[in-house]
């Protein structure tokens, strides 16, 4: 059971300092940005972080939204991450869920974070180069020391 | 209680090849990996590689790469590791040990090799 | 390839000793670090995770700290079934590196 707490806004980076944006199409990309560009961007780089209590104990539980004309949510449905058209639920009814990520810091680093699926036990998010493309993806890892699975939460409230 | 069982000790000679099995035996949850590791006589431990279970992806030691193949049977639960072109500094005790998280109190997540086999004794000698 | 220097190679004590074995990592591994026990004949046994963490069934005379590069085995008090090599392990990146391993030898 998660049930819904605050929200923050918030900009995401990875560990090259490049900024998680959601593009015309609806893919979380990766880019290099300038903090006016990131800015100007606006508010495909600001990320609505909800906290949900956790009814097991397992790290912070959240969503990862954006609102551009309609809220989507960060789903890692079937292990493939894309942004759904739906606002975060107040509630819900079970211990897994799709949209639903621990964020945790990295042990002795408080500003570096990881993000593991409540669906999938050892997956977590992370920045995969993809042609010229920096993606966001879900990653069975088992390498926890790897710089692709952490990213640094900024505060924009 | 997850217990690994290996197969027996192994003879053999420069050049040749060897397989050492390592089967699974008790519940053991989704999520983990097969490790090999060696310790020679007289030197310590060596980490060779390991194996997912999941989709069979490996990743191997530098040093071992070109001789070395993890495999894994999955409806038997059992793995392999086989090593080519035997020298004589082969010679070693082999292990396989599961990898799976274990989890701190705030569920922070961290891999550990918990279970171990018994070991497998190979001596490679002309 | 990340080199985990571990120290003492070998040290000789007496039961009640308190002894302290360290491990020095070539680059920040966080606290993805693990200590195992081997002894003659036997499969190593996992003693400490996550650098600080007591295995469930391992004697609480058995303590780990450390975080980064520098990390640090101790047993408070020798107990006589302790003697045994000891090794740290890396799990942060592949490969996976341990240290060459503390023999503990009765004094």
């Known amino acids: 059971y998660f049930g819904k707490l605050e929200s923050k806004l918030s900009v995401i980076r990875n560990l090259n300092d490049q900024v998680l944006f959601i593009d015309q199409g609806n893919r979380p990309l990766f880019e290099d940005m300038t903090d006016s560009d990131c800015r100007d961007n606006a508010p495909r780089t600001i990320f609505i972080i909800s906290m949900y209590k956790d009814s097991q104990p397992r790290g912070m539980a959240v969503t990862i939204s954006v609102k551009c004309e309609k809220i989507s949510t960060l789903s890692c449905e079937n292990k493939i991450i894309s942004f759904k058209e739906m606002n975060p639920p107040d509630n819900i009814k079970d211990t897994k869920s799709d949209i639903i990520f621990f964020q945790r810091s990295v042990p002795g680093h408080d500003n570096k974070m990881q993000f593991e699926s409540s669906s999938y036990e050892g997956y977590f998010l992370a920045c995969e180069k993809e042609r010229d493309l920096f993606k966001l993806i879900l990653k069975k890892e088992d390498e926890l020391g790897d710089r692709s699975i952490m990213f640094t939460v900024q505060n924009e409230d | 209680q997850v217990q690994l069982v290996q197969s027996g000790a192994e003879v053999k000679k420069p050049g040749a090849s060897v397989k050492v099995s390592c089967k699974v035996s008790g519940e053991i949850s989704t999520g983990y990996y097969f490790h090999w590791v060696r310790r020679r006589p007289g030197k310590g431990l060596e980490w060779m590689g390991r194996i997912d279970p999941e989709d069979d992806s490996t990743k191997y030691a530098e040093r071992f790469k070109d001789r070395v193949t993890m495999t894994e049977d999955t409806s038997t639960d059992t793995a392999y590791m086989e090593l080519s072109s035997l020298r004589s500094e082969d010679t070693a005790v082999y292990y396989c040990t599961t990898w799976r998280i274990y989890r701190d109190s705030s569920g922070r997540p961290f891999y550990v090799m918990d279970a171990w086999g018994q070991g497998t004794l190979v001596t490679v000698s002309s | 390839d990340i080199q985990m220097t571990q120290s003492p190679s070998s040290v000789s004590a007496s039961v009640g000793d308190r002894v302290t074995i360290t491990c020095l990592a070539s680059e920040d591994i966080y606290t993805y670090l693990t200590w195992y026990q081997q002894k003659p004949g036997k499969a190593p046994k996992l003693l400490i995770y996550g650098a600080n963490k007591l295995q469930d069934g391992v004697p609480s005379r058995f303590s780990g700290s450390g975080s980064g590069t520098d990390f640090t085995l101790t047993i408070s008090s020798l107990q006589p079934e302790d003697f045994a090599t000891y090794y740290c392990?890396?799990?942060?990146?592949?490969?996976?590196?341990f240290g060459q391993g503390t023999k503990l030898e009765i004094k």
């Open positions: 392990l890396q799990g942060s990146k592949f490969p996976l590196t």
